[in-house]
């Protein structure tokens, strides 16, 4: 018992002596955060000058405070022990570590391109004022059906697969009427209506696709992640939409 007590005391003395010799060798190690070791004044600890800070002890200089100017605004003021923190003014959002950049907001249903804010292409959406347009979820990949159609601002909502729909549940396509004798004119007119609707849809789709192809060729966009601050666009919407494939990080696309 006495032996172990002796060991503890010896260790404590050793540690205390080490700390003493270390501070004798390097008096700067005693300087706390918010101060710096002033070589010009016999290495005494001097407080950081205004607009500077030191976040750790034993520093020989204080760092200049970050200034939140222009589109940046101060989220946290600089103190003698910590740097200022910035965020972006409304209409802009932060990018990069510690909000090193501010990027212009667009509207939901748009994305920011080199030429400003562009509407999302058909089949893509952006539910935020920042970021890129992303493809609608493909419900069929999960064996589900589309419950709510997608828009430029919102993704599709997937529902149960058509097979899972219980009898009596409302279905998009009406069930085919039962074949009964003496009802052939109704059946014929029903199928005629169905075929003409399908043809109309096909015609509409082809027209739409042709116009998108033409427009896509007319305006090939180079889309990039902006390394600088964009000026605020006074007119956010231009004609045309910004098209990209999901796997593309940069560059435009032709439909």
């Amino acid at each position: 018992m006495g032996n172990s007590c002796y060991n503890i005391v010896a260790t404590l003395l050793l540690v205390l002596n080490f700390e003493r010799t270390r501070s004798l060798q390097d008096p700067c190690s005693n300087c706390p955060a918010g101060t710096f070791c002033d070589n010009n004044r016999n290495q005494i600890c001097s407080p950081c000058p205004p607009n500077s800070f030191s976040s750790a002890g034993g520093q020989r200089t204080c760092d200049i405070c970050r200034q939140c100017k222009g589109v940046f605004r101060t989220r946290k003021e600089c103190s003698s022990t910590s740097n200022a923190e910035c965020d972006c003014t409304p209409g802009f959002h932060c990018l990069g570590a510690g909000c090193s950049m501010c990027e212009q907001d667009c509207k939901q249903g748009q994305e920011l391109t080199k030429k400003g804010c562009k509407d999302c292409c058909f089949g893509t959406f952006n539910d935020q004022k920042r970021g890129i347009c992303r493809p609608w979820t493909n419900c069929s990949l999960d064996g589900k059906s589309v419950l709510v159609n997608g828009t430029k601002e919102r993704d599709v909502v997937c529902g149960p697969s058509p097979a899972d729909l219980s009898p009596g549940a409302s279905s998009v396509t009406p069930p085919a009427p039962a074949r009964e004798p003496g009802h052939s004119p109704q059946i014929i007119s029903f199928f005629l209506a169905l075929t003409s609707t399908a043809l109309l849809f096909l015609l509409f789709f082809l027209t739409l696709r042709f116009s998108v192809v033409k427009r896509g060729r007319k305006k090939l966009l180079y889309i990039f992640k902006q390394p600088f601050m964009r000026p605020v666009q006074t007119t956010q919407e231009e004609d045309g939409c910004s098209c990209r494939f999901p796997e593309e990080e940069e560059g435009g696309c032709e439909l």
Partner: antibody, heavy 117, light 107 residues
Framework: EVQLVESGGGLVQPGGSLRLSCAAS????????IHWVRQAPGKGLEWVSG????????YYADSVKGRFTISRDNSKNTLYLQLNSLRAEDTAVYYC??????????WGQGTLVTVSS | DIQLTQSPSSLSASVGDRVTITCRAS??????LAWYQQKPGKAPKLLIY???NLETGVPSRFSGSGSGTDFTLTISSLQPEDFATYYC?????????FGQGTKVEIK
Amino acid sequence: EVQLVESGGGLVQPGGSLRLSCAASGFTFTSYGIHWVRQAPGKGLEWVSGISGAGDTTYYADSVKGRFTISRDNSKNTLYLQLNSLRAEDTAVYYCARERDYDFDYWGQGTLVTVSS
Amino acid sequence: DIQLTQSPSSLSASVGDRVTITCRASQSVSSYLAWYQQKPGKAPKLLIYDASNLETGVPSRFSGSGSGTDFTLTISSLQPEDFATYYCQQSYSTSHTFGQGTKVEIK
């Protein structure tokens, strides 16, 4: 379907630590900031912390700054909140919430953290 | 930090009533304000974003208005499922502050 599921809550002594997790599914995780919001029993909502989609910018309420650390693992679609130096006033249900344009459009069901000796 | 003050703290109303809840900010938050509904034991649900935009799937009886410092949430005709606590939240500053809440109870 967007889902957020919190876990890791429990009883802890004052001064103790805890790590909360929030597993996300049904959306592109990296495209959204995620936040922690807490609610003390019988009280209102209090924003705690937030992190950007890339994980490179973090935000904290003054009441937790220096004690709590928010992080995310985008490869696992998981958000974390490390709670250190816990106090009795940290007792609350902790919700993770997806940020869409600075508002919170989807919330988890919450996990209860009780700080008591 | 920006403070949000809701009024009233609680109110009693009947089904079919028109209900108005106000939220006042200690400084201008532009239109960066959202409204949430919370029922006991459940997570909050987003109702209104950007002060006046109705969130997808939220009934049209809910509406929001205002900008700057004064905001209003209106329920045009109160339904049984609307009895809950309502919170406003500002996102003008990155410290997303919430109002203290307004409890809507059955009269």
